[in-house]
Interface confidence: medium
């Protein structure tokens, strides 16, 4: 009985990919649709409401036609057939066009990044050799958290010129290790901007800034907000003097009181002389009492 189904019934051979095919049984699609015809008319598939299982048949036909992986001319027009692809399928592809990448990301728009999409992006970026600005622009537009999903090693391939594509929200989920990699790139990218413009651009990267850069910023009347200050590296904040923090925060310095129990404010307070803290007039407590000698143990260790 199954053998009877292998031949295409008379008059049902598909001459083009069109809406009539949605009424074909799966075995009829298999028998009556030529794979080469399908490949040349892939752009039509997306507009035709094939069922979930009919698409399995179409995918199978493409897999047979291109066992080594689909050419980009087919990939660009996969449309929702892309959702049927496995990461193993995608690893066979060579996607070089940003237009192809955008077309496939559009299919998955509004959903979490699937393993298929992650594999596609990985293939694309590796093919390009680096995460250039246009690619980063595209990826962060579809997935604002994309940048923070990369390892510090992967982030090291981001050229400083690409940093211009990064928006503050793209860094929301980055951890300190990632910001440590991104901050020097941002510093380089924005180095020719003037003080206030520079601060606006660099602000969201400051979780990777070292002490000396924070000291330099404190001399520029930047008025850093508390949310940014709370994301700074604790080890970078600890050496700052009360006067430097006051200059860094400007009118926002009053917010320290509300954060005095949280890092890095808590740890910073413990390192300051209490009478220096008192000059802020905020009632911050926990500093080093007057008359106590402050030993810089890190310096002592370095000398021994």
């Amino acid at each position: 009985r199954e053998v009877e189904k292998t031949a295409c019934p008379s008059g049902k051979k598909a001459r083009e990919i069109d809406e009539s095919l949605i009424f074909y049984k799966k075995w009829e699609l298999e028998a009556c649709v030529d794979a080469a015809l399908l490949a040349t008319q892939m752009d039509r598939v997306n507009a035709i409401p094939f069922t979930y299982e009919q698409l399995d048949v179409l995918k199978h036909k493409l897999d047979e036609l291109y066992p080594q992986g689909y050419p980009e001319s087919v990939i660009q027009h996969l449309g929702y057939l892309f959702l049927k692809m496995s990461p193993e399928d995608i690893r066979k592809w060579n996607v070089t066009s940003l237009e192809t990448l955008k077309a496939l990301l559009e299919v998955n728009k509004g959903h979490e990044m699937s393993p298929q999409v992650a594999t596609l992006i990985d293939r694309f970026v590796k093919g390009r050799g680096q995460l250039d600005k246009d690619t980063l622009d595209t990826l962060t537009a579809f997935y604002p958290g994309y940048l923070c999903s990369l390892s510090p090693e992967e982030l090291s391939s981001v050229p400083p010129s690409s940093i211009w594509a990064v928006r503050p929200q793209d860094l929301d989920t980055c951890d300190p290790r990632q910001l440590d990699v991104l901050y020097p790139k941002a510093r380089l990218a924005f180095q020719n901007m003037n003080g206030s413009e520079y601060f606006v651009k660099i602000q969201s990267f400051l979780g990777g800034a070292p002490t000396e850069d924070l000291k330099a910023l404190s001399q520029q009347n930047v008025s850093m907000d508390l949310a940014t200050f709370m994301k700074l590296r604790t080890d970078a904040v600890l050496p700052l003097t009360v006067a430097e923090v006051q200059k860094l925060l400007g009118p926002h310095v009053e917010g320290l009181k509300a954060e005095e129990r949280h890092r890095p404010v808590r740890d910073w307070i413990l390192r300051q002389r209490q009478d220096d803290l008192d000059t802020l007039g905020l009632g911050l407590q926990g500093g080093i009492p007057n008359g106590y000698l402050v030993l810089d143990l890190s310096m002592q260790e370095a000398l021994s």
Epitope: K25, N46, P49, F50
Partner: nanobody
Framework: QVQLVESGGGLVQPGGSLRLSCAAS????????MAWFRQAPGKEREIVAV????????YYAESVKGRFTISRDNPKNTVYLQMNSLKPEDTAVYYC????????????WGQGTQVTVSS
Amino acid sequence: QVQLVESGGGLVQPGGSLRLSCAASGRTDSTYNMAWFRQAPGKEREIVAVINWTGGGTYYAESVKGRFTISRDNPKNTVYLQMNSLKPEDTAVYYCAATRTSWTENTYWGQGTQVTVSS
């Protein structure tokens, strides 16, 4: 098993509009294509409109193109048929259907809702 329940049918004057809804329940998910069929008295059941499982691809019978719009809300497991510029020949029982396979096999059907276009 998939259960489909249609609503929104009724009596309407020529040129009027109706919006049919079909709520799916049971073993359904967003991988089902959904469709509206209709059957007029003494005629065979015919397909009216289809929407695929992503909501991207659609199909309309020639007789309703430009007048009817099919849409779906996957989180609500509901498919809609917006019918404008209704004509007397649109009078029929409208059935909601769902399949993952094809419209000629493994298709689930609703009970139908009557649409009457008359002055």
